[in-house]
């Protein structure tokens, strides 16, 4: 907490400019009017305030806006955002995607912090759903963002937003999340032709049911083993040897290397030995 002291004569700030970087903490507190700071927030990031001085600026804004900052201030916080706690951020109402982008830019190159998670949560709740533009923005800054959401939160993602999702965005998703995302992806990509459809749907297939895998096996898709290994075990078990052979195409030989791992192990145990022998891979059921 900065002590209340009178501003020395001639030091009262008329505007937010670089002369303030030479002010001591107590001088900043005494000589900078909070309302002036709020109206000239756009200047703050162009001025090389020390990290310590940012504490004083935050303190002034907190006093001026005890119920939470207005968006006109939030959008210009820049490095001041790093001084905010999740509790501070919960008081905000952020509606502009540009404001969100500006604050995410400050955190670029870092893992998601509790502050950023709170900011995103406030923003998405304010919008009511994860629209395509928001998803584009969030996955650009945080490729793992989608997989950080609960299945319940993912249910608010409209199918149109799925077009923004890149394969790497789903790397850390678990089966429950893919169960929610897969039907949306299927709907989003339904008008694409066979090979293009498979390219797009491939990274979502961890949520696909048996009947969709059977349908894919009729389309010469040549699924790679990495994708096959991410399929739901309960969806793979009912597939016949012939269906798996068609699904994997030339990649079927990879089953041998994965015979001790799920879902391959469990699938092998469900098959007749005669059928497995037709693959010529030496798989033992």
């Amino acid at each position: 907490e900065v002590e209340k002291t009178a501003c020395p004569s001639g030091k009262k700030a008329r505007e937010i400019d670089e002369s303030l970087i030479f002010y001591k903490k107590w001088e900043l507190e005494a000589c900078v009017d909070a309302a002036l700071l709020a109206t000239q927030m756009d200047r703050v990031n162009a001025i090389p305030f020390t990290y310590e001085q940012l504490d004083v600026l935050k303190h002034k804004l907190d006093e001026l806006y005890p119920q939470g900052y207005p968006e006109s201030v939030i959008q210009h916080l820049g490095y001041l955002f790093l001084k905010m706690s999740p509790e501070d951020i919960r008081k905000w109402n952020v509606t502009s995607l540009e404001t969100l982008k500006a604050l995410l830019e400050v955190n670029k190159g870092h893992e998601m912090s509790p502050q950023v998670a709170t900011l995103i949560d406030r923003f998405v709740k304010g919008r009511g759903q994860l629209d395509k533009d928001t998803l584009d923005t969030l996955t650009a800054f945080y490729p793992g963002y989608l997989c950080s959401l609960s299945p319940e939160e993912l249910s608010s993602v409209p199918p149109s937003s799925i077009w923004a999702v890149r394969p790497q965005d789903l790397d850390t998703c678990d089966p429950r999340q893919l169960d929610v995302l897969y039907p949306k992806a299927r709907l989003a990509f339904q008008n694409m032709n066979g090979s293009e459809y498979f390219v797009k749907i491939q990274s979502f297939l961890g949520g696909a049911p048996t009947e969709d895998l059977k349908a894919l096996s009729q389309q010469n898709v040549s699924m790679d083993l990495a994708t096959f290994m991410k399929l739901r075990t309960d969806a793979v078990l009912p597939l016949t040897v012939a269906e798996v052979q068609k699904l994997l195409g030339p990649h079927v030989e990879g089953l041998k290397a994965e015979e001790r791992h799920r879902p391959v192990r469990d699938w092998i145990l469900r098959q007749r030995q005669d059928d497995l022998d037709t693959l010529g891979l030496g798989l033992q059921g």
């Epitope: 162009a46 090389p48 990290y51 310590e52 504490d55 490095y79």
Partner: antibody, heavy 116, light 107 residues
Framework: EVQLVESGGGLVQPGGSLRLSCAAS????????IHWVRQAPGKGLEWVAS????????TYADSVKGRFTISADTSKNTAYLQMNSLRAEDTAVYYC?????????WGQGTLVTVSS | DIQMTQSPSSLSASVGDRVTITCRAS??????VAWYQQKPGKAPKLLID???RLYSGVPSRFSGSGSGTDFTLTISSLQPEDFATYYC?????????FGQGTKVEIK
């Protein structure tokens, strides 16, 4: 991709001058701050100077004040360190780095040797 | 200027060990501390800033903690690629200052 490339190092006699350059790509230096940090052979890191090109604000370590000048040419996206009155103790690898407070990107460094 | 004192200046450890490096500031620097890793002949690399905020691509075995004057970098399970020199830096006030470094060597 963000990159910083230093150049201009070399062997110079005590009392001599050198100008180091730091060419930036993948970001605009006018929206960042650029710092020079040096490391004497077998020693730790020492901050030397910083510039905020937007306002032209500069700051220096006491050990180089009055002898070194940091500057930037935003049209060339390049920062410079003009080193005058060089001393043996200025011998070091000089790195330029980007960052407002912490330094998230560094160049590969350029060696400055001050010796007669 | 704020002095940053690191300890130990060097340590020997084995792969899988938990390693802790401390950094003490001569005055309060709040959360304004970053940690860097440097390998011989290479530039330093940012690991952590804001005392505990992990930089992208840095393995989660690295963590930072502390506040005020005492800060810690912890490597939960040392890996072969972690043998290097580590530096703390305070950026709370100008000039930014670095610790003298801690060299982590193979036992």
């Amino acid at each position: 991709e963000v990159q910083l490339v230093e150049s201009g190092g070399g062997l110079v006699q005590p009392g001599g001058s050198l100008r180091l350059s730091c060419a930036a790509s993948g970001f605009t230096i006018s929206k960042a701050s650029i710092h020079w940090v040096r490391q004497a052979p077998g020693k730790g890191l020492e901050w030397v100077a910083s510039i905020w090109p937007t306002k032209g604000f500069t700051t220096y370590a006491d050990s180089v004040k009055g002898r070194f000048t940091i500057s930037a040419d935003t049209s060339k996206n390049t920062a410079y360190l003009q080193m005058n009155s060089l001393r043996a103790e200025d011998t070091a690898v000089y790195y330029c780095a980007r960052g407002r407070y912490w330094l998230d990107y560094w160049g590969q460094g350029t060696l400055v040797t001050v010796s007669s | 200027d704020i002095q940053m004192t690191q300890s130990p200046s060097s340590l020997s450890a084995s792969v899988g060990d938990r390693v802790t490096i401390t950094c003490r500031a001569s005055q309060d620097v709040k959360e304004g501390v970053a940690w860097y890793q440097q390998k011989p002949g290479k530039a330093p690399k940012l690991l952590i800033d804001e005392r505990e905020r992990l930089y992208s691509g840095v393995p989660s075995r690295f963590s930072g903690s502390g506040s005020g004057t005492d800060f810690t970098l912890t490597i939960s399970s040392l890996q072969p690629e972690d043998f290097a020199t580590y530096y703390c830096q305070q950026y709370n006030t100008w000039p930014a200052t670095f610790g003298q470094g801690t060299k982590v060597e193979i036992k």
